[in-house]
Interface confidence: medium
């Protein structure tokens, strides 16, 4: 199709080489076209539609994304050619940064239901650059945490080194939806609740003598509880003795609950005590069996191919540790009678 009639938007993604970050493009079809299928209230009512209404379907995923190759080849369907780019409804997610993401991206409705719809498309010229210098040592991260129940803030990474007074007007989106009142480089959250978690996008306009660009950054915000003040506790084994049958295989499970820590380095391991000797056992990898906002339950098993007489004289010790401290639970094997 002819893309000369598409409205054009220029975007700049300056990524940090030190951190993983994502990027998004919204299918910014002019109002009222997009409201027919994207259900996203993102332009203010004052903005006049550039085209006649799009008569498309109401299916949320009813847009098609293409990339325009720089060599003039035909448009390429994003889904077929770019595995690191994911389409979610009207949004294109770039999972990894890199200058190779630079280029022209076109979105338009899949269903063309009227002659006016042919021009119902947007061409986004994306320029991707690595951050050149560490002019701002403490720029905000693309992953930010908000502590549940307290006051917090979300900073726009590309503007976090500027004072509020210097900062240009910023447009914020949360999960693709315009936050119409937020206009500064930092959103203050009075009281953090779980609904504040999500993907935030901050946009501002940068102009030179020739043209203007939308500088965009994406922030993944998660809501967290405060770091635990407790060492982990062992949920299983509860008893310090275990009845076993000699010659039979045996699995002993150690389950421990670890409270939330922002920097989480849980330790769960088995070791064996035999008179004066003590050694760690290479057992199967630990696995998380339950994870909630406040804590995580991790399990690690010790497997004996067959229980020997010698094992009855040993103590099997489960050791768990977090940054606060450690806990142990030992198990003595006892031969089953009768």
């Amino acid at each position: 199709f002819n893309i000369s009639g598409c409205s054009t938007k220029k975007l700049l993604w300056t990524y940090s080489t030190r951190s993983e970050e994502e990027f998004v493009l919204f299918c910014d079809l002019p109002e009222p076209q997009k409201s027919h299928f994207c259900h996203r209230n993102r332009l203010s009512p004052k903005q006049v539609p550039e085209h006649l209404p799009f008569m498309g379907s109401n299916d949320l995923s009813d847009v098609q994304w293409y990339q325009q190759p720089s060599n003039g080849d035909p448009l390429e369907d994003i889904r077929k050619s770019y595995p690191h780019i994911i389409q979610d409804k009207c949004t294109l997610h770039f999972l990894t940064p890199g200058v190779n993401n630079s280029g022209s991206y076109i979105c338009r409705p899949k269903m063309i239901k009227s002659p006016y719809d042919v021009a119902c498309c947007v061409k986004m010229i994306l320029e991707v650059k690595p951050q050149t210098n560490a002019s701002c040592e403490y720029s905000a991260s693309h992953k930010q945490d908000l502590l549940l129940g307290s006051t917090g803030s979300i900073s726009c990474p590309s503007l976090s080194c500027q004072s509020d007074a210097q900062s240009p007007a910023v447009t914020w989106y949360k999960n693709g939806k315009l936050l119409s009142v937020e206009r500064s480089n930092r959103i203050v959250v009075d009281e953090v609740y779980d609904y504040h978690q999500g993907t935030y996008v901050c946009d501002y306009t940068q102009s030179d003598t020739v043209s203007s660009w939308t500088v965009r950054a994406v922030v993944q915000v998660r809501t967290i509880v405060g770091d635990t003040k407790l060492k982990p506790d062992i949920l299983d084994p509860v008893e310090d003795t275990l009845e076993v049958e000699l010659g039979k295989p045996l699995t002993i499970s150690c389950k421990a609950r670890f409270g939330f820590e922002r920097v989480f380095n849980p330790v769960i391991k088995w070791y064996i005590k035999d008179s004066d000797l003590e050694w760690e056992v290479s057992v199967p990898e630990a696995k998380s069996i339950k994870s909630t906002l406040k804590d995580e339950i991790i399990e690690r098993n010790i497997i004996l191919e067959k229980v020997t007489q010698r094992d009855l004289r040993r103590k099997f010790v489960c050791f768990v540790q977090n940054s606060i401290g450690n806990t142990t639970q030992s198990v003595q094997l006892k031969e089953k009678r009768g």
């Epitope: 006051t151 979300i154 939806k177 936050l179 937020e182 959103i187 203050v188 959250v189 009281e191 609740y193």
Partner: antibody, heavy 122, light 111 residues
Framework: EVQLEESGGDLVQPGGSLRLSCAAS?????????MCWVRQAPGKGLEWVAC?????????YYASWAKGRFTISKDTSKNTLYLQMNSLRAEDTAVYFC?????????????WGQGTLVTVSS | DIQMTQSPSSLSASVGDRVTITCQAT??????LAWYQQKPGQAPKLLIY???TLESGVPSRFSGSGSGTDFTLTISSLQPEDFATYYC?????????????FGGGTKVVIK
């Protein structure tokens, strides 16, 4: 007993100013609440005016028509909420309610004052 | 600012009737909606918050439903003390703040 009591309502001329107060008792202002002003013109519906968060951020929120003319503030030491109203117009005539919104989950108002009447007339 | 549109603006009903009041927001407010009852000369009283959670002490004949832009308040069997004016309110602050707006009200009168 937990309650809110408004005062300061009066007859004022168009273009004049007025400051309303709301004294809170039975709870601590330094806890995290949204303290708001809601008004109701005679025979009309409820109209939200402004809110202030009593927590550390102290964020203020205004209805678009109230921005610039009305200012919400608080004095935590006195457990009192204020609404400074300037350039008053006849259409500002209403009963002004002080209201406490819960800090959590979008703050529905559980506690209301009985209201104070503001009449703007020449 | 967000606008809340309530309908009908008034309705007449009899004791025992099932009454439904609707409220529509001009943008998605998730479930940040409250319903209030107001009687003449009194301050409003909270009935329902977060769209469907019944405030403690409120009779179970009141129920709320909906999310996004469309919400409903239902009184399953109207009682004499329920004749009053009902308001919906968008109760969103902070990051999700759009406006703490009220609907125009629905006056429930005796048929």
């Amino acid at each position: 007993e937990v309650q809110l009591e408004e005062s300061g309502g009066d007859l004022v001329q168009p273009g004049g100013s007025l400051r309303l107060s709301c004294a809170a008792s039975g709870f601590d202002f330094s806890s995290n609440y949204y303290m708001c002003w809601v008004r109701q013109a005679p025979g009309k519906g409820l109209e939200w005016v402004a809110c202030i968060y009593t927590g550390s951020s102290g964020s203020t929120y205004y209805a678009s028509w109230a921005k610039g003319r009305f200012t919400i503030s608080k004095d935590t030491s006195k457990n009192t909420l204020y609404l400074q109203m300037n350039s008053l117009r006849a259409e500002d005539t209403a009963v002004y309610f002080c209201a406490r919104g819960a800090g959590s989950y979008g703050g529905a108002v559980r506690l209301w004052g009985q209201g104070t009447l503001v009449t703007v007339s020449s | 600012d967000i606008q809340m549109t309530q309908s009908p603006s008034s309705l007449s009903a009899s004791v025992g009737d099932r009454v439904t009041i609707t409220c529509q927001a001009t943008e998605d407010i998730e479930s940040f909606l409250a319903w209030y009852q107001q009687k003449p000369g009194q301050a409003p009283k909270l009935l329902i918050y977060r769209a469907s959670t019944l405030e403690s002490g409120v009779p179970s004949r009141f129920s709320g439903s909906g999310s996004g832009t469309d919400f409903t308040l239902t009184i399953s069997s109207l009682q004499p003390e329920d004749f009053a004016t009902y308001y919906c309110q968008c109760t969103v602050y902070g990051v999700n703040f759009v406006a703490n707006a009220f609907g125009g009200g629905t006056k429930v009168v005796i048929k």
